[in-house]
Each structure stands twice: as C-alpha cells, then as structure tokens.
C-alpha cells in the first residue's frame, strides 16, 4: 500500500513540475527591465526565451519573437537546449511511469517489469528536473553577469554613441517557476525511484530437497514446512523434517521402496 | 549594431518651418523611445519631444505648440516638424533611440551625430 501510495505520489508531483517546466519555457517574463528613468512614457521591457516584450503606462504591450537562431547569445541557446532536453525527458517518463503504476493493470505485466519502468521514469524525471535547474540557473548566472557588468559606453563613432541603458534589471517570474518546477519533478522522480525498491519482487528460493520416508507413517511437525528465502534461519540447508526429510547435501541413497524423487 | 542618422537640418528664417528626420539602421530587433535633444552653444542637452513605441508623446513646454513629433514604426523613422521657429532654437538637434538588443541581451541608447538648426532674426 505504501509502495503504491509513494508510487503514485511521485508520479502527480513530477506531472506537475514537468507542466511547470513546459510553462517556464514559454513563459514571457524570464528577464524585466524597469525603465522608470525614460523620459518619455515609464516602460517595462521583458524577455523569454522565444520573444521579448514591451509594456507601456499607456498600456501598449508588443512582443517581437527572436526570429532568427544567429545574434542571440550562446548562453540563450544553451537554455533553451536544457529546457527543451527536460520537457522531453519529462513527457517520455510520464509516459512510461502510467504504464508502471501498480493501480493500473495492462495484460499481464509482471511486477519486476513494472519494477523496472518504475525505475526508468523515476530516472528520466531526475535528469528532467535537473535539466531544468541547471537551465534557469544558467540564465540567471547570464543576466547577474551581463548587468553587473560596466554600463560605460560601448562605442563612439562618427559623432553618435551607443550606451547600455541604466535600468533596474530584475529575475522574472519565470525563473522562480522554473525552479520550483525543476525542484518538483527532481522530487517525483527520487520518490519513483524508492518506490521501484518496494516494487521489485523478493527472490524466493526454494531448496532442492529430496524426502526419505523411513517407513509408511511419517510424523510430519505442523507448520514444518518452511520455503526457504535466504533471510530465515534456514540457510545452511539443515534439515526441516524430523522424518527423514535430508537436503541434497546430506542425501545418502538407500535404495527403497517408499523414496520420492 | 544600431545607428540612427538626422537629417533636415539647416538654415531658416524666423518664424518660417523646418522637419527635421531620424532614420535608424542596422541589426535593429526592436526600438522602444524615441527622442529629439538639442544643444545650443554654452548649455546642456535637453529633451525636446520624445514619442514611444505605442505612440506616447512627451514635449518640453518651450516648444508645446509649435512642434509635433511623429514617428513611423515599421520604418524605424521619427519626424520632428518644427513651426513658428524662433531664435531660441538655434542648436545642434540630437536623435535619440533606446533598443532591445537580443544579441547582447541588453538595453541600448543610441546616439546620432547631430544636425544643425540655425534660425536667423
């Protein structure tokens, strides 16, 4: 019961990181830029990963996609590898962790395979998570050492100037989601993974034991008959039965009419 | 990189009109603001008339009645049309843009070189 309770557990927590990945990624508002010192209208600028924004006083708002993969940062591109290589993972180990739900029943798959897919996802969801951190956490690292760089003039030429503007540049919310979401899904999947050791089937070995009954009425002890499995008192092969009941070990063939083997 | 150009500069009589042009080029994703400074001989830079993206205009008072902004945003162009000028706004005009620049992932101002404005009595 727990097994399955754990189970299903990781499985809704990484379903809702991974739906969290899939919004941080197409979220707008990855980067903001207040621009309170414009001396026209107060502007808010705003960037994803896909597109960047503006929003005006006036309530105006245009949003423009990077149309083109050249000129953009290599660290931009990298970020979206991440986010993308995390969705992916995320969506295969959902995939895969529905049919390893012990609730659900598909023919008749045996518990070591669900073991194993338990385990595959819980994997997928791990690397999926931490893709996703490792994304968002690029992109801050990218915009804490792009704007505490020197905002001195970039270039003066032929009388005309360009400068980085002096703005408040601040995370967007979707670097929070980002990392609450990679957090989730990295979570479901360590829960998935404990709960693949619950599933996995214990390996009952059974002793070959050979039965010598020394004569037509054997006493059989109740509850004598113990399997063994590798955990009881049982593991030197000893013998179970009073009754003439010998391991393979200790077999001594006398040839009789009552042997069973 | 982005650059912007005046143009429309030049000499006038007083009270006669002059448009003055601001035309930006280059590797240009999106411009935000964009301003007209000027500099007369002596004195600081000051705003003249700015207008944003979504059409927002701002004036310094001296020139509240007398000059309309505009801009066409699909040709990265702002137009300044200058009327009833006077003595006083005899200065070096400056085109000012403030840009995206998805490449550097930063906020740009660009400057243009300047052009002039002589309005004789």
């Known amino acids: 019961m727990a097994v399955t309770a754990c189970q299903g557990l990781g499985f809704v927590v990484s379903l809702i990181g991974i739906a969290g990945i899939i919004a941080a990624t197409c979220m707008d508002q990855w980067s903001t830029q207040d621009l309170y010192n414009n001396p026209v209208t107060a502007v808010f600028n705003y960037q994803g990963l896909w597109r960047s924004c503006v929003r005006e006083s006036s309530g105006f708002t245009e949003c423009r996609g990077y149309f083109t993969l050249l000129g953009l940062p290599a660290m931009l591109q990298a970020v979206r590898a991440l986010m993308i290589v995390g969705i992916v993972l995320g969506a295969i180990g959902l995939l895969v962790s529905i049919f390893a739900l012990k609730c659900i029943r598909i023919g008749s798959m045996e518990d070591s395979a669900k073991a194993n897919m338990t385990l595959t996802s819980g994997i997928m969801f791990i690397v999926s998570g931490l893709c996703a951190i490792a994304g968002v956490s690029v992109f801050a690292n990218m915009l804490v050492t792009n704007f505490w760089m020197s905002t001195a003039n970039m270039y003066t030429g032929m009388g005309g100037m360009v400068q980085t503007v002096q703005t408040r540049y601040t995370f967007g919310a979707a670097l929070f989601v980002g990392w609450v979401a990679g957090g989730l899904t990295l979570i479901g999947g360590v829960m998935m993974c404990i709960a693949c050791r619950g599933l996995a089937p214990e390996e009952t070995n059974y002793k070959a034991v050979s039965y010598h009954a020394s004569g037509h009425s054997v006493a059989y002890k109740p509850g004598g008959f113990k399997a063994s499995t590798g955990f009881g008192s049982n593991t030197k092969n000893k013998k179970i039965y009073d009754g003439g009941a010998r391991t393979e070990d200790e077999v001594q063939s006398y040839p009789s009419k009552h042997d069973y083997v | 990189e982005v650059q912007v150009q005046e143009s429309g500069g030049g000499l006038v009589q007083a009270g006669t009109s002059l448009r003055l042009s601001c035309a930006a080029s280059g590797n240009i994703f999106r411009i935000d603001t964009m301003g007209w400074y000027r500099q007369a001989p002596g004195k600081q830079r000051e705003l003249v008339a700015g207008i944003s993206r979504g059409g927002t205009t701002t004036y310094a008072h001296s020139v509240k009645e007398r000059f309309t902004i505009s801009r066409d945003n699909a040709k990265n162009t702002m137009y300044l049309q200058m009327n009833s000028l006077k003595s006083e706004d005899t200065a070096g005009y400056y085109c000012?843009?403030?840009?995206?620049?998805?490449?550097?992932?930063?906020?740009?101002?660009?400057w243009g070189q300047g052009t002039l404005v002589t309005v004789s009595a």
């Open positions: 000012n843009a403030q840009a995206w620049d998805p490449g550097t992932f930063r906020y740009l101002e660009v």
